[in-house]
C-alpha cells in the first residue's frame, strides 16, 4: 500500500531567512514541509495539524504550540490551538491563518504539517451468502465463533445503539469530534443522523445480519449528520482509541474506519502507529472508481484495506462512480445491497450500498479469527485474510486496464473453520508504486515489519528495465525495481511471508563473463533457495543470446542472463524445504504460467531468460506469472522463447506444531 | 450490579390513568431500550411494548394502540409507562424488563383497577 | 403475530427427575428464543437466552436446544428449588410473545 510516494501537494517551504525572535532553527538545517489535500473541495484551509519530531514529549509539544501562539501574536495574528496530541502521534492542531505557516515551519521540533481536510462516509443507501463458506447455509448462518473476544470500534456517524439488531452489544463512547453541518436550512433529523453507523454496526455484529454475532462493539462520533468528518477528527478519534488501550488492556481491538478521504500523510502516520501498537485497523477502499492510494486511510500500508463486490463478484458501481481499486486494496467484500439495521425504527432494516459496508464484513471476520485465535499479529490475519479469500472470481474488465495487474482478485471469506490454520506457509504480493519514468527511476516494494521478503521481481508495461534487487533497509529487506532509459516506469513486487524463525539473507552474483551466464546459489548449510532476482546496467540485454537453461540437478541455484547480475534470496527456518518448478513455452507467447501444488506455497517468481522482452514477472495467488511483449511484434524466433520459474517452498516445521497443538 | 426498580403498587378506578415508572442502573441505558410486559392474575405473560432511551422512540402490541404511551428520561434513566382509560381486565402485575431480548426484569408493580 | 404453543401445561416430577418442556413456533424464529423461570409472586428470571445459552449464574442443569421452529428446555436433574412455572419467548419479531407456560409440580 501506499508508502512514501503519495499523490497529493506536498508545499515545501524552503525557509531560509531568519524569522526575528526565533530562538531555536530547526535541526540539522532540515526544513519542515507543508502538506494539503490534492482535491480542492475538501480541503479545509484555517486549520492545521503541526506534527513534531517522534521522540518530542508531550510538554515540548504544548511548549511549541505557545511559542507560535506568542510569535504569531507578535504579528498581529489570533491563533487558538483546539488540541495537543500525545499517545499516538505528539504534535497540535491549531486554527490560524495561513499566513502563519512560514512561521509554523521553522519551529522547533516540527517534522510536518498538514492542513485540514475532510473524510467522508463512504455508503450509498446476499452479503453472508458470500463469505460463508459452502459448510453453513447463509439463511442458517451461526459462525462457529461469533467474535466474543473481541472488540470491534467503529469510527463513523452517531447510532442508535438500542436497535433490536444491535441492543447491548455496542457501547457508545463520550468521543465525538464532528465538524458542523453544510448549509443554513439542514435539518438534524436523529435517525438521518444515525443511518450508517447504525447499518455498519449491524453488519459487523448484528444479531440476525451481522457476521460476527458475538463481537462487542464501542462507537465513536467522527462523522455528522452528513457523513462528514474531519482529518483531524479522525486523529483524535485515534489517539482515544490509543489511551483507552493503555488505560484498560482488553482483548484484541479491531479499528473500522468506514470513511475516506483526501491521501493524507499525518492520518496515515496515525494509522501506522496504532497498527504497531498491536490494534488491527480496517477502512474502506472508497467509493471514487479510483486508486486507492489517493485516499485516506485507504492508503495506508499498515491497514486492511477493502473494495466492494456485489452478489456476483463484481465490483460495485455507484451510481457513476464505484469502488476504488489497485494496489492499496487488499482483498473485496461484499458491498452492494447489503441488509442490516436501520436507524428509521428499532426493529427497521435497510440495504446500502459501498465499500463501508464491505469494510465492516472483514471487520467482522477478523472479530472472528481473532476470537478464535487471539495471539494473531495484523501480518498473520492480513495473510489469513488473503489466503481464505476466494480468489480470481472478479471480473477485471470494469477495472482501467493498467490497474488490472496491481488489483488484487480476492474477495473476502470465513475460513472454513476458524482453527488449524497454522501449519500453512502464508505469502502474499506486495506491489510497489509506480516508478515514474526518468532513466534512474526505481521503484521500492516492502513488506510489513513481521514478514519476511522471500523474493522480488518487476514488472514494466513498455518492457524497459533493468530488473530488480533485494536490498537491506534500515535492517530490512526490500524489493527496488530499475526503469531503464526509454521506459515508462517500473513496478518492484514482493512476495512477502510468515516464516517464524527465519534467517535469511541475499547471495549476489556478479554479470558472467562466459557466455554460459550468470549463476549464483546458497551455498550456506541448511539455506534453501526462496527467489530469484536479476538486475542489469545495460539498457538492453542482449535479446539474441539463447535462452539460459538450469542445469539438471541444481535446484538451489538461480540462473540468469551473462550481462546480469543475479540475487539468490536463502533462508534458513525450521523445516523450510523448496523446490523450483519451471514451465518453458518454445513459441513466443504474451502470458506463460506456472503453479505451485497443493500444499506448496509460491515464494519466488521469475523468467528465464531476462531479456529485453519479457515484460517482467509476479505472483498472483500461488501461480508465477511472467508476462512478455505483444506475440506479434517479438516474431518466433528463439528469444519468443519464455520461462516462467516458480520456488514453491513449505514449512514442516508449522506443519508439526499445527499437528501437535490438535 | 443492573437493576430495574420499578413504582410502588397502584389502585386505581375505571376510566383513570396510571403511571408506572422504571429506574434502571448498573449499565449505559442508551444501549438498550425498555420492554414493558404484564401479567393478569393467574394468567401468562403479555408484551405490552417497548420504548429507547437513546432517542425516545416507541414501538406497541396492536392492542394497547391508543390507550398507553411508554416514554423515557434519560437524565435520570427512567422509563415510564402510562395506561389510560383503565378497565377492569387492565388489572395486572406490571414489569419492566431490559430490551426487547427481556434479560433483567423489574420486581413488578401491580395495578388494581377497581371501582 | 408468531403463535407461541409450549407443552405440556403441567406436569408432575420428582427431585432428581430429568424434565424436557417443548415449545413450537408457529414460524421459523431462527434461534431467538429464551426461557424464563417465574415463581410465584416474582418478576421472571432468565434461564437460557437464544436458544442454548445460559446467562452467568444459571445453573448447569439448565439446558436448552432448538432452531427454527421447534424447542426445548432440559432440566437434567430437578431441585427443589426448581418447582416454578416455564415460559418460552421469541423476540425474533415483534410483538415479542410468550408461550402459555408449564407449571411444574412435585410429585
Known amino acids: 500500500q501506499e508508502d512514501e510516494d503519495g499523490d497529493y501537494e506536498e508545499l515545501v517551504l524552503a525557509l531560509r531567512s531568519e524569522e526575528d525572535g526565533l530562538a531555536e532553527a530547526p535541526e540539522h538545517g532540515t526544513t519542515a514541509t507543508f502538506h494539503r489535500c490534492a482535491k480542492d473541495p475538501w480541503r479545509l484551509p484555517g486549520t492545521y495539524v503541526v506534527v513534531l519530531k517522534e521522540e518530542t514529549h508531550l510538554s515540548q509539544s504544548e511548549r511549541t504550540a505557545r511559542r507560535l501562539q506568542a510569535q504569531a501574536a507578535r504579528r498581529g495574528y489570533l491563533t487558538k490551538i483546539l488540541h495537543v496530541f500525545h499517545g499516538l502521534l505528539p504534535g497540535f492542531l491549531v486554527k490560524m491563518s495561513g499566513d502563519l505557516l512560514e512561521l509554523a515551519l521553522k519551529l522547533p521540533h516540527v517534522d510536518y504539517i498538514e492542513e485540514d481536510s475532510s473524510v467522508f462516509a463512504q455508503s450509498i443507501p446476499w452479503n453472508l451468502e458470500r463469505i460463508t463458506p459452502p459448510r453453513y447455509r447463509a439463511d442458517e448462518y451461526q459462525p462457529p465463533d461469533g467474535g466474543s473476544l473481541v472488540e470491534v470500534y467503529l469510527l463513523d456517524t452517531s447510532i442508535q445503539s438500542d436497535h433490536r439488531e444491535i441492543e447491548g452489544r455496542v457501547m457508545v463512547t463520550d468521543f465525538e469530534n464532528v465538524p458542523e453541518e453544510d448549509g443554513t436550512r439542514f435539518h438534524r433529523q436523529a435517525s438521518k443522523c444515525d443511518s450508517h453507523g447504525t447499518h455498519l454496526a449491524g453488519v459487523v455484529s448484528g444479531r440476525d445480519a451481522g457476521v460476527a454475532k458475538g463481537a462487542s462493539m464501542r462507537s465513536l462520533r467522527v462523522l455528522n449528520c452528513q457523513g462528514k468528518g474531519t482529518v483531524s477528527g479522525t486523529l483524535i478519534g485515534l489517539e482515544f482509541i490509543r489511551k483507552s488501550q493503555l488505560v484498560q488492556p482488553v482483548g484484541p481491538l479491531v479499528v473500522l474506519l468506514p470513511l475516506a478521504g483526501g491521501y493524507s500523510r499525518v492520518l496515515n502516520a496515525a494509522c501506522q502507529r496504532l497498527a504497531r501498537a498491536g490494534v488491527v485497523l480496517v477502512t474502506a477502499a472508497g467509493n471514487f472508481r479510483d486508486d486507492a492510494c489517493l485516499y485516506s486511510p485507504a492508503s495506508a500500508p499498515e491497514v486492511i484495506t477493502v473494495g466492494a463486490t456485489n452478489a456476483q463478484d463484481q465490483p460495485v458501481t455507484l451510481g457513476t462512480l464505484g469502488t476504488n481499486f489497485g494496489r492499496c486494496v487488499d482483498l473485496f467484500a461484499p458491498g452492494e445491497d447489503i441488509i442490516g439495521a436501520s436507524s428509521d425504527c428499532s426493529t427497521c432494516f435497510v440495504s446500502q450500498s459501498g465499500t463501508s459496508q464491505a469494510a465492516a464484513h472483514v471487520a467482522g471476520i477478523a472479530a472472528m479469527m481473532l476470537s478464535a485465535e487471539p495471539e494473531l499479529t495484523l501480518a498473520e490475519l492480513r495473510q489469513r485474510l488473503i489466503h481464505f479469500s476466494a480468489k480470481d472470481v472478479i471480473n477485471e474488465a470494469w477495472f482501467p486496464e493498467d490497474q488490472r495487474v496491481l488489483t488484487p482478485n480476492l474477495v473476502a471469506a470465513l475460513p472454513p473453520s476458524t482453527h488449524g490454520a497454522g501449519w500453512q506457509l502464508f505469502c502474499r504480493t506486495v506491489w510497489s508504486a509506480h516508478s515514474g519514468p526518468t532513466r534512474m527511476a526505481t521503484a521500492v516494494a516492502r513488506c510489513a515489519p513481521d514478514e519476511e521478503l522471500l523474493s522480488c521481481s518487476s514488472f514494466s508495461r513498455s518492457g524497459k528495465r533493468r530488473g530488480e534487487r533485494m536490498e537491506a533497509q534500515g535492517g530490512k529487506l526490500v524489493c527496488r525495481a530499475h526503469n531503464a532509459f526509454g521506459g515508462e516506469g517500473v513496478y518492484a513486487i514482493a512476495r512477502c511471508c510468515l516464516l517464524p524463525q527465519a534467517n535469511c539473507s541475499v547471495h549476489t552474483a556478479p554479470p558472467a563473463e562466459a557466455s554460459m551466464g550468470t549463476r549464483v546459489h546458497c551455498h550456506q548449510q541448511g539455506h534453501v533457495l526462496t527467489g530469484c532476482s536479476s538486475h542489469w546496467e545495460v539498457e538492453d540485454l542482449g535479446t539474441h543470446k539463447p535462452p539460459v537453461l538450469r542445469p539438471r540437478g541444481q535446484p538451489n541455484q538461480c540462473v540468469g542472463h551473462r550481462e546480469a547480475s543475479i540475487h539468490a534470496s536463502c533462508c534458513h527456518a525450521p523445516g523450510l524445504e523448496c523446490k523450483v518448478k519451471e514451465h518453458g513455452i518454445p513459441a513466443p507467447q504474451e502470458q506463460v504460467t506456472v503453479a505451485c501444488e497443493e500444499g506448496w506455497t509460491l515464494t519466488g517468481c521469475s523468467a528465464l531468460p531476462g531479456t529485453s522482452h519479457v515484460l517482467g514477472a509476479y505472483a498472483v495467488d500461488n501461480t508465477c506469472v511472467v508476462r512478455s511483449r505483444d506475440v506479434s511484434t517479438t516474431g518466433s524466433t528463439s528469444e519468443g522463447a519464455v520461462t516462467a520459474v516458480a520456488i514453491c517452498c513449505r514449512s514442516r516445521h508449522l506443519a508439526q506444531a499445527s499437528q501437535e497443538l490438535q | 450490579q443492573v437493576q430495574l426498580v420499578q413504582s410502588g403498587a397502584e389502585v386505581k378506578k375505571p376510566g383513570a390513568s396510571v403511571k408506572v415508572s422504571c429506574k434502571a442502573s448498573g449499565y449505559t441505558v442508551t444501549s438498550y431500550g425498555i420492554s414493558w410486559v404484564r401479567q393478569a392474575p393467574g394468567q401468562g405473560l403479555e408484551w405490552m411494548g417497548w420504548?429507547?432511551?437513546?432517542?425516545?422512540?416507541?414501538n406497541y402490541a396492536q392492542k394497547l394502540q391508543g390507550r398507553g404511551t411508554m416514554t423515557t428520561d434519560p437524565s435520570t434513566s427512567t422509563a415510564y409507562m402510562e395506561l389510560r382509560s383503565l378497565r377492569s381486565d387492565d388489572t395486572a402485575v406490571y414489569y419492566c424488563?431490559?430490551?426487547?431480548?427481556?434479560?433483567?426484569w423489574g420486581q413488578g408493580t401491580t395495578v388494581t383497577v377497581s371501582s | 403475530d408468531i403463535q407461541m404453543t409450549q407443552s405440556p401445561s403441567s406436569l408432575s416430577a420428582s427431585v432428581g427427575d430429568r424434565v424436557t418442556i417443548t415449545c413450537r413456533a408457529s414460524q421459523n424464529i431462527n434461534n431467538w428464543l429464551n426461557w424464563y423461570q417465574q415463581k410465584p409472586g416474582k418478576a421472571p428470571k432468565l434461564l437460557i437466552y437464544?436458544?442454548?445459552t445460559r446467562p452467568t449464574g444459571v445453573p448447569s442443569r439448565f439446558s436448552g436446544s432448538g432452531s427454527g421452529t421447534d424447542f426445548t428446555l432440559t432440566i437434567s436433574s430437578l431441585q427443589p428449588e426448581d418447582f416454578a412455572t416455564y415460559y418460552c419467548q421469541q423476540w425474533d419479531d415483534t410483538p415479542n410473545t410468550f408461550g402459555q407456560g408449564t407449571k411444574v409440580e412435585i410429585k
Open positions: 420504548v429507547s432511551f437513546y432517542n425516545g422512540n416507541s
Open positions: 437464544g436458544a442454548s
Open positions: 424488563a431490559r430490551g426487547y431480548s427481556l434479560d433483567v
